[in-house]
């Protein structure tokens, strides 16, 4: 017990008070008269005397009180066992109960805690993501403007090392233009020297041509009968073609016609006898325009039309518009065959796309898709692709269904932003998507966590920058 | 040159809604609707020209300005030549004049646009 206190009341009454935690129990216990020694009654209204009693009453009384008190003693020892009984029964009622109450108030706040928690996860989650999309976006910004500013900072640098060696140019031409005049005055005189011997000369060789002329007239008549046996020759060359055209149209009929000297693609240069890797010059269709491509003969039984490849940095891809259409580079290393050239050609018959790529560990892998083309430029040179097979990802990294082609001055993507301008070169970019074969090219050491770089997302991940790409074609029948 | 012109703008107090069409017509022989992506912009007085909303040729795909984002919404009759800015929950920052965009070739054709004003 936390506390017991014994007192009297008004009355005569003894009350014992029992505390035990917040609860406080109080019991009125009558006087016990029946406890008192029958030898000795007690007066409850005797005068208190002056002088002290005998001593053998006096003892007799203590006996007397100390019964009593012996009395009090086990009647209270007994009170306290039956109060700790009650108490514990009541107790362990009073925890039920309270436990029962208490458990449903916490099932309930419980619930309500999880439901708040719940929502402000949703919220957070909702939050993160747009922290996450500004964040993105704003690296990339940041990324655009540090790249800028350091293109800046070598284009001032360079510039002003032209312009201290211009200066020394300057002064070098000065020395020589002062040089060249006292050159000049000396080389006149020699030139009127050499005139007077010219004018010599020009006299004799009047006379040389005179007797040419007379030679020439002979020559003129030996030439007309030479002339008309050329004539008669001719005429029996004809007669003979014509006598073999005949009869051999009707053996083969390909021999009459004229040799193909133009080809659309590299399937039709590999098909006439030229299976050698190498620039060739293809022919637009339905047109006389021409366009110079790399055609790979031995990858995969020949015959592909290179139309991107990055190996080395050294050409820029971030190009405009008009750049992209009738495009730019070096066929025999970097470039872009051109937008128009490839819309014409896969709108004319069906072709497959292959993409090769290699990373900086050594690895290579492919996507090939079996049916390939380009819209007009009307709609923007938008990209068209069906069943992907290969090994650089299950899931196409170029979004299907295709995007419009965006360049740093044509932005046709699906995105607020401006795909090609923050992740640099033009590709059919969605918002923006996961692949940029045009991005910037990074060297080995250099070429992770970049956005802008050449990215073949279900390959190497986004931030993974290739070491090399080439994209080919080939009409699907080949 | 493809025709566009942009009905349902008016004067409307916050909290209010408008729905805003764009009929295209005008494109090249051979040429449909349903082959171009179309665009939702608009510009606010003093303001720089803002990118609203995009959708695909073939009305799958949308996207939006972080702005407008949960309030408005883009679709496209491919039918009827049409396109629709849904807006619901109007502020008085959505005042601005609203123009439908095409890009072909990679040259833009814009509508004259509609005047929306939000005000108490």
């Known amino acids: 017990y936390n506390n017991f206190r014994k007192s009297m009341d008004s009355i005569g009454k003894k009350q014992y008070q029992v505390q035990h935690g917040s609860c406080s129990y109080t019991f009125l216990l009558p006087e016990m008269d029946n406890c008192r020694s029958s030898s000795s009654p007690y007066v409850s209204n005797a005068v208190q005397r002056d002088a002290p009693l005998e001593y053998d009453d006096s003892v007799q009384r203590l006996q007397v009180l100390e019964n009593i008190m012996e009395n009090n003693t086990q009647w209270l020892m007994k009170l306290e066992n039956y109060i700790q009984d009650n108490m514990k029964k009541e107790m362990v009622e009073i925890q039920q109960n309270a436990v029962q109450n208490q458990t449903a108030v916490m099932i309930e706040i419980g619930t309500n805690l999880l439901n708040q928690t719940a929502e402000q996860t949703r919220k957070l989650t909702d939050v993160e993501a747009q922290v996450l999309n500004q964040t993105t976006r704003l690296e990339l910004q940041l990324l655009e403007h540090s790249l800028s500013t350091n293109k800046l900072e070598k284009q001032i640098l360079d510039q002003t090392s032209e312009i201290n060696k211009l200066q020394d140019k300057n002064s070098f031409l000065e020395k020589k233009v002062l040089a060249m005049e006292d050159k000049h005055i000396i080389q006149l005189q020699s030139i009127k020297e050499e005139k007077d011997q010219l004018q010599v000369l020009v006299s004799k060789q009047n006379s040389i041509i005179e007797e040419l002329e007379k030679k020439i007239v002979t020559a003129t008549v030996n030439n007309s009968v030479l002339q008309k046996q050329q004539h008669d020759l001719m005429e029996t060359v004809n007669n003979l073609l014509t006598m073999m055209s005949t009869s051999n149209s009707a053996k083969d009929p390909t021999v009459a016609k004229e040799e193909q000297i133009s080809f659309r693609d590299c399937a039709e240069v590999f098909k006439s006898g030229h299976t050698t890797n190498g620039i060739y010059t293809l022919t637009f269709p339905n047109s006389t325009e021409e366009i110079k491509a790399y055609c790979d003969m031995e990858a995969g039984g020949g015959g592909w039309t290179i139309i991107q490849r990055r190996e080395d940095g050294s050409v820029d891809f971030q190009r405009t518009w008009k750049e992209y259409k009738v495009g730019f580079g070096n066929p025999s290393g970097e470039y872009w065959l051109g937008n128009e050239f490839v819309s014409q050609l896969t709108n004319q018959q069906r072709y497959v796309l292959k993409i090769h790529l290699k990373d900086w560990e050594g690895n290579e892998a492919y996507s090939l898709y079996e049916h390939f083309y380009l819209s007009s430029e009307e709609l923007n040179y938008r990209i068209h692709l069906k069943g992907l097979t290969g090994t650089a990802g299950k899931i196409s990294s170029i979004s299907q269904p295709g995007n419009d082609f965006s360049t740093k001055d044509g932005d046709n993507d699906k995105c607020i932003c401006k795909c090609s301008q923050m992740l640099t070169g033009g590709w059919w970019f969605d918002a923006c998507g996961p692949s940029n074969l045009n991005g910037m090219y990074y060297p080995q050491r250099q070429n992770t966590n970049k956005f802008n770089g050449i990215k073949w997302y279900y390959w190497k991940g986004s931030g993974y920058s290739l070491k090399a790409t080439t994209m080919m074609i080939r009409p699907a029948d080949f | 040159e493809v025709q566009l012109v942009e009905s349902g703008g008016g004067l409307v107090q916050p909290g209010e809604s408008l729905r805003l069409s764009c009929v295209a017509s005008g494109f090249p022989s051979g040429f449909t609707f349903s082959d171009y992506q179309m665009y939702w912009y608009r510009q606010a007085p003093g303001k720089e020209r803002e990118l609203v909303a995009i959708?695909?040729?073939?009305?799958?795909?949308?996207t939006y300005a972080d702005s407008v984002k949960g309030r408005f919404t883009i679709s496209r009759d491919n039918a009827k030549n049409t396109m629709f800015l849904q807006m619901n929950s109007l502020k008085p920052e959505d005042t601005a004049v609203y123009v439908c965009?095409?890009?072909?070739?990679?040259?833009?054709?814009w509508g004259q646009g509609t005047q929306v004003t939000v005000s108490s």
């Open positions: 959708i695909s040729n073939d009305g799958l795909r949308k």
């Open positions: 965009n095409v890009r072909r070739a990679n040259r833009d054709d």
